[in-house]
Interface confidence: medium
């Protein structure tokens, strides 16, 4: 009888679909080649497919195989019209595997899923589960066409790790899972605000998010001109206020307020303020004489336009008299004054339409 | 079926103490945060103490009003969950639940409630 | 703190009927980012612990029967039940879960004329 060929050995790739069948050749000498025979065990739908090699192979490979399907393999030695017991095994081609799933589009209520679609026909769709992690019953579960490559799942909960599974569907079968872990992000805060605006302070306040577990809110500000020179303040999650104080005066300041629930941090809430222009400084008065002074000051530290400065008798209640230097100037001599008057003096800096708080002096001729 | 059942109820004159407890079954008790509310005679819901799992360091929760009188803890192994009340008042008198916290999230309500346990503060 | 206020107090009616009663909270409940309502509604049954019925303002618990709904969004929400039955008869409460403390409403005592 002819010996049938030995160690068979089969291989289904579930990328691309093909079944590699290998083998050792057969002892007979002078034969004619090898029969290959793929079919379905126990009467299943699916194709019964067929090879013939020659003598000096020892492997072949079919395509077209429905994964997840048993077929049995055989290979017979055959010489002429004459063949061999077969050597057998069997097989079930796996179900094709995501391979590159990602997520995308994270937030406190949602995850975006993405992937490649599998290029097989026996392929019917996806379906896709989510789990808490640590728990073990899907809270989600659905199901998308063969050829959907991106969804959202949606009616999350904040700062929650997920466990969210992709599974290749096939009639009557499933690949394996894909599973991915993932957090939602932590909730961000809501409702920025600035008020109390002073030249090197300001509040800022903003309405906490729902979470009775935070673990602290991060308050990040810098000047707009310079945000690497960043300062951070850790705030008690009870709180949801604070005062940034030794601020630069006349300067825009970017403000971002997160949340952090353990350690993890929810996107900035941003804002922008400037704070205030702050007064000029040191008034002092040279010079007088009976109907002339000069008033004299140092400069704010903010950048400013000029200065606008006022005077006036102390017991005066008309409208007093205004002059106006550029920011280059810090004096000013007042003339065609009363002799023997005590005048009150007030300088503000001005940038543009922005003024400072009073600067007030009193000098008499 | 989840089942909260507490005991250690009681009579108690004020500025005393007492511990209430909680046994916690059909449930994976270890991942859960769980709660004490209480019930004044004749009057609404107030909640009491909160105690998170051990993956979230055990941290605790007090309402005002029993902050640095009582302590909530709890003991995994046994499915347990305790009250430790000190310093009892008069208006401390109230039915206290056991209660399991609802939901896999940083948000919560009281999905499971037990049948409660009576304290009385009285000379 | 979240003050929470419950109307009316005590409300009869008669079986058959349909009932609504209103919460309202000092603050909002409803949180920007997911469009939630973080406001639960329980049911105290005379000598029973309390049960939950609404979470999320909106969402029934499971085993509950579909003729409780609660609606509203923001500060002001109802509790309705569409035909009351003889078991409905209790006291209804309303808790927010928006920030600590947790607070609820003093309740609603339903009664049958």
């Known amino acids: 009888p002819l010996s049938p060929p030995t160690n068979l050995h089969l291989e289904a790739n579930p990328d691309t679909g093909v079944l590699t069948v290998s083998w050792e050749r057969s002892t007979t000498p002078d034969i004619t080649g090898y029969r290959i025979t793929t079919t379905p065990t126990n009467g299943q739908q699916g194709n019964s497919l067929e090879e013939v090699v020659h003598a000096d192979q020892s492997s072949c490979t079919f395509d077209n195989l429905s994964p997840g399907l048993e077929y049995n393999v055989s290979v017979y030695t055959v010489k002429d019209d004459k063949e061999s017991v077969p050597i057998s095994d069997t097989i079930i081609p796996e179900v094709p595997q995501l391979t590159d799933l990602s997520f995308v589009d994270i937030t406190d209520s949602s995850i975006g899923l993405r992937w490649t679609p599998l290029n097989s026909s026996t392929i019917i769709g996806y379906r896709i589960t989510v789990v808490a992690a640590g728990e073990g019953i899907p809270i989600f579960e659905d199901f998308v066409d063969s050829s959907v490559g991106y969804y959202t799942v949606t009616g999350l909960e904040p700062g929650i790790d997920y466990d969210i599974s992709v599974i290749t569907l096939i009639n009557g079968g499933e690949s394996a899972p894909t599973t991915l872990t993932q957090q939602t992000a932590v909730p961000p805060p809501t409702d920025l605000r600035f008020t109390n605006i002073g030249p090197d302070t300001m509040r800022v306040t903003w309405a906490p998010p729902p979470s009775i577990d935070l673990t602290n809110f991060l308050v990040r500000y810098s000047p707009v001109k310079n945000e690497e020179d960043v300062a951070e303040l850790s705030i008690s999650p009870s709180d949801n206020a604070v005062v940034l104080t030794n601020l630069l005066p006349g300067t825009e300041y970017v403000v971002s307020v997160s949340s952090v629930y353990e350690q993890h941090e929810s996107t900035p809430l941003r804002g922008r303020q400037k704070t205030g222009l702050d007064s000029p400084t040191g008034i002092d008065f040279s010079d007088i004489t009976a109907n002339s002074f000069t008033v004299h000051w140092i400069a704010p530290r903010a950048t400013i336009t000029g200065y606008r400065i006022r005077h006036h008798p102390e017991h005066f209640s008309g409208r007093p008299r205004e002059d106006r230097v550029p920011h280059s100037r810090n004096s000013i001599t007042l003339t065609n004054l009363t002799p023997g008057t005590e005048y009150v003096v007030s300088i503000v800096a001005l940038n543009g339409r922005e003024e400072s708080p009073l600067l007030i002096g009193q000098q008499s001729t | 079926e989840v089942q909260l059942v507490e005991s250690g109820g009681g009579l108690v004159q004020p500025k005393g103490s007492l511990k209430i407890s909680c046994a916690a079954s059909?449930?994976?008790?270890?991942?859960?945060?769980m709660n004490w509310v209480r019930q004044a005679p004749r009057k609404g819901l107030e909640w009491v103490a909160r105690?998170?799992?051990?993956?979230?360091?055990?941290?605790?929760y007090y309402a005002d009003s029993v902050k640095d009188r009582f302590t909530i803890s709890r003991d995994d192994s046994q499915s347990m969950l305790y009250l430790q009340m000190n310093n009892l008042k008069t208006e401390d008198t109230a039915m206290y639940y056991c209660?399991?916290?609802?939901?896999?999230?940083?948000?919560?309500?009281?999905?499971?409630w037990g049948a409660g346990t009576t304290v009385t503060v009285s000379e | 703190d979240i003050v929470m206020s419950q109307s009316p107090s005590s409300l009869a009616v008669s079986v058959g009927e349909k009932v609504t009663m209103s919460c309202k909270s000092s603050q909002s409940l409803l949180y920007s980012s997911n469009q939630k309502n973080y406001l639960a509604w329980y049911q105290q049954r005379p000598g029973q612990s309390p049960k939950l019925l609404i979470y999320w303002a909106s969402t029934g618990e499971s085993g509950v029967p579909d003729r409780f709904t609660g609606s509203g969004s923001g500060t002001d929400f109802t509790l309705t039940i569409s035909s009351v039955k003889a078991e409905d008869l209790a006291v209804y409460y309303c808790q927010q879960y928006y920030s600590y403390p947790l607070t609820f409403g003093a309740g609603t005592k339903l009664e049958l004329k």
């Open positions: 105690i998170r799992s051990k993956s979230n360091n055990y941290a605790t």
């Open positions: 059909g449930l994976t008790f270890n991942t859960y945060a």
């Open positions: 209660v399991k916290q609802g939901g896999n999230s940083l948000y919560w309500y009281f999905d499971v």
